[in-house]
Amino acid sequence: MMTGTIETTGNISAEKGGSIILQCHLSSTTAQVTQVNWEQQDQLLAICNADLGWHISPSFKDRVAPGPGLGLTLQSLTVNDTGEYFCIYHTYPDGTYTGRIFLEVLESSVAEHGARFQIP
């Protein structure tokens, strides 16, 4: 029975050339987190394994930094970074929980953070 919920930073916006932190938080479950995958659409950005640590995909090494915590920091943002990002929490014994974040990279200097929201 999967009782957990994932809270994410929700719909967020950031300036071109700037950086943004993608954050998810798993709550309401005692399940053990074994691995967290970060994906952009169907492309792997990074993995944080409880035993093995962090792996950043080679194609993102220059612009992606691990953390804070299980989150991910995207740097030197471009308009092409606009889109859906997913945090996938692999847990034992519950299974897999997925959170969704939509990032919009803006040309202008006006970039506001969206509200936090929950995915059951």
């Epitope: 994906e39 394994n49 035993d51 997925t98």
Partner: antibody, heavy 121, light 108 residues
Framework: QVQLVQSGAEVKKPGASVKVSCKAS????????MHWVRQAPGQGLEWMGV????????SYAQKFQGRVTLTRDTSTSTVYMELSSLRSEDTAVYYC??????????????WGQGTTVTVSS | EIVLTQSPGTLSLSPGERATLSCRAS???????LAWYQQKPGQAPRLLIY???SRATGIPDRFSGSGSGTDFTLTISRLEPEDFAVYYC?????????FGGGTKVEIK
């Protein structure tokens, strides 16, 4: 070419331990993760665990936690799998398999020839 | 853990025929984190396909993989005598990495 050569067959008594070796050649040993997979007679494949390039990091399947230990010796390009408290159900062929990527992708690209471990009283 | 169910258990075909093997996951395998292996009697498994559809180095193009989510397929377009073996699917999306029970392709 990339090669993984494993140690010979073992016969052990219940309660004993076994240590299987896997010697790698043909690639940069310190660049790849190594998995261990076992196959009981007439059965399918079962992932046991993985060890990092430096040997500092390991991850084990819950089923084998506390009973299996993976180590590696960089000087001889050898990885070891030790399984303790053996029981008859541990009778199987044990394989080492090198990962396909520069991390623990889980894609097992190159396999050793296998080591048969028989547990019998 | 993700359970992979392969079907059929045994496939009896003649050389030159087309083989279609199925692998179903108990939960969605995102981004097609699925591999296929071939194993002949007394030998170690050999990687055929990864990423659901990418052929491993040196694998002939008669082997092809497809599918996404929970349903995946390995197709051998024209069976050669050396293709008669057991085939396993494996997911590497969610640890622990798990294998299907296998499909035996035997000569009819």
């Amino acid at each position: 070419q990339v090669q993984l050569v494993q140690s010979g067959a073992e016969v052990k008594k219940p309660g004993a331990s076994v240590k299987v070796s896997c010697k790698a050649s043909g690639y940069t040993f310190t660049s790849y993760y190594m998995h261990w997979v076992r196959q009981a007679p007439g059965q399918g494949l079962e992932w046991m665990g993985v060890i990092g390039p430096s040997g500092a990091s390991t991850s084990y399947a819950q089923k084998f936690q506390g009973r299996v230990t993976l180590t590696r010796d960089t000087s001889t390009s050898t990885v070891y799998m030790e399984l303790s408290s053996l029981r008859s159900e541990d009778t199987a062929v044990y394989y080492c398999a090198r990962d396909h990527s520069d991390y623990w992708s889980g894609i097992m690209e190159v396999w050793g020839q296998g080591t048969t471990v028989t547990v019998s009283s | 853990e993700i359970v992979l169910t392969q079907s059929p258990g045994t496939l009896s075909l003649s050389p030159g025929e087309r083989a279609t093997l199925s692998c179903r996951a108990s939960q969605s395998v995102r981004s097609s984190y699925l591999a296929w292996y071939q194993q002949k009697p007394g030998q170690a498994p050999r990687l055929l396909i990864y990423g659901a559809s990418s052929r491993a180095t040196g694998i002939p193009d008669r082997f092809s993989g497809s599918g996404s989510g929970t349903d995946f397929t390995l197709t051998i377009s024209r069976l050669e005598p050396e293709d008669f073996a057991v085939y396993y699917c494996q997911q590497y999306f969610s640890p622990p990495w798990t294998f299907g029970g296998g499909t035996k392709v035997e000569i009819k």
